[in-house]
Interface confidence: medium
């Protein structure tokens, strides 16, 4: 089995999250592919995920969640934008494969965001302001309707270098849904 | 195999600015974190920043937060440094270097595999 | 900031010894850790990366061990090209800090 590692970030509330996963290029370009949350004890929810099939270089937005799948480069990129302390948590990529159960792509994402703005560990300031600028050709897609029950259902055990975080609920809805939180104009 | 080749050797005065360029060859550039890094005369290594050339968005340690722009520019597949202000304290060898691994996180790389020579920059009245 | 502390942080050995420096993080950083090599008038040479992955192409005498906050860099028998300073780096939260560096002389 693959050892499930995680990798860190520590930012401030209104700083923005910047990953890049990547993936197989010739595998899984043009797949839908999935932004998760992963809760103790609970199925991995989707937060956002790209179109079927999936575009390239095209951004989608959901809420505060920006996608962007550069098949050229076999990498999505996932913004969270406006962090809140409460998005505090682990996250995951996956690659929807109907029939078949989706594929996780590695490293999980261990977010923490605290209170009060400083301008690292983030990108510059100018880019993590509490507005953000969305390119006008943003669009939202649906995710699929299904979370395989052969997915993790139970987070691994946190690695010594997590901080812990409360567990109370993030403001991101369930995991069908689109996600109902204001687009910054 | 990505080489990275900087630019040459600046002398300048305080209050002013220096931008050092690094530029890849062979090998992919698009996707990999390049780090920048510096030493000064006597001191230890110092990470400065690091920027994704597809994404553009770059990343600081809070201590050059206010002075350091990096940028890259992918069709000429070159990095950018600039630092403003400049102090006597800021005379250094700068080195940009490239983050090996892929990983999921905007700026893993599991360590810096492929260095530039170096840029010697003097700060002095 | 993550404050990586190094020691020693000079060392004297001879051709043939086995050498061992150490770093400690402030605090843990699971296995997000690389150490380097470096020599006057030249860039860093990476040696170790996720605290005990040997980079291609060096020598299999340099070994890395630990995870959380101690680890440790291991020249199993000294070679005269190993003259120099070792610094390790942690990735895993920014800024990346170095460690003071550790330098390594003849005896």
């Known amino acids: 089995a693959t050892k499930l590692t995680e990798e860190k970030y520590e930012l401030k509330e209104g700083q923005t999250l910047d990953v890049k996963c990547d993936y197989t290029l010739e595998k899984f370009a043009s797949s839908q592919k999935a932004w998760q949350i992963i809760r103790d004890g609970e199925m991995p929810k989707t937060l956002a995920c790209t179109e079927r099939p999936s575009k390239n270089s095209h951004p989608v937005q959901v809420g505060r969640i920006i996608l962007e799948d550069y098949h050229d480069h076999g990498l999505l990129r996932v913004r969270m934008v406006n962090l809140q302390v409460e998005d505090s948590g682990l996250y995951q990529c996956v690659i929807y494969q109907p029939p078949k159960e989706p594929h996780m792509l590695f490293d999980r994402i261990r977010l923490v965001v605290t209170k009060g703005f400083s301008g690292t560990p983030g990108s510059n300031e100018n880019s993590t302001q509490n507005v953000y600028k969305i390119p006008p050709t943003t669009t939202k897609a649906l995710c699929p309707l299904y979370t395989s029950p052969r997915t993790v259902t139970q987070a691994p055990p946190k690695s010594t270098a997590d901080v812990s975080t409360p567990d109370s609920e993030i403001n991101l809805t369930n995991v069908t849904d689109i996600i109902r939180v204001p687009v910054f104009n | 195999q990505v080489q990275l080749v900087q630019s040459g050797a600046e002398v300048k005065r305080p209050g002013s600015s220096v931008k050092v360029s690094c530029k890849a060859s062979?090998?992919?550039?698009?996707?990999?974190?390049i780090s920048w890094v510096r030493q000064a005369p006597g001191q230890g290594l110092e990470w400065m920043g690091g920027?994704?050339?597809?994404?553009?968005?770059?990343n600081y340690a809070q201590q050059f937060q206010d002075r350091v722009t990096i940028t890259a520019d992918e069709s000429t597949r070159t990095a950018y440094m600039e630092l403003n202000s400049l102090k006597s304290e800021d005379t250094a060898v700068y080195y940009c270097?490239?983050?090996?691994?892929?990983?999921?996180?905007?700026?893993?790389?599991?360590?810096?595999?492929?260095w530039g020579q170096g840029t010697t920059v003097t700060v002095s009245s | 900031d993550i404050q990586m502390t190094q020691s020693p942080t000079s060392l004297s050995a001879s051709v043939g010894d086995r050498v061992t420096i150490t770093c400690r993080a402030s605090q843990g950083i699971s296995s997000w850790l690389a150490w380097y090599q470096h020599k006057p008038g030249k860039a860093p040479k990476l040696l170790i990366y996720a605290a005990s992955s040997l980079q291609s192409g060096v020598p299999s005498r340099f070994s890395g061990s630990g995870s959380g906050t101690d680890f440790t860099l291991t020249i199993s028998s000294l070679q005269p090209e190993d003259f120099a300073t070792y610094y390790c780096q942690q990735y895993n939260s920014y800024p990346y800090t170095f460690g003071q560096g550790t330098k390594l002389e003849i005896k």
């Open positions: 062979g090998g992919t550039f698009s996707i990999y974190v």
């Open positions: 920027i994704i050339p597809l994404f553009g968005t770059p």
């Open positions: 270097a490239r983050g090996h691994g892929p990983g999921s996180s905007h700026y893993s790389y599991y360590g810096l595999d492929v």
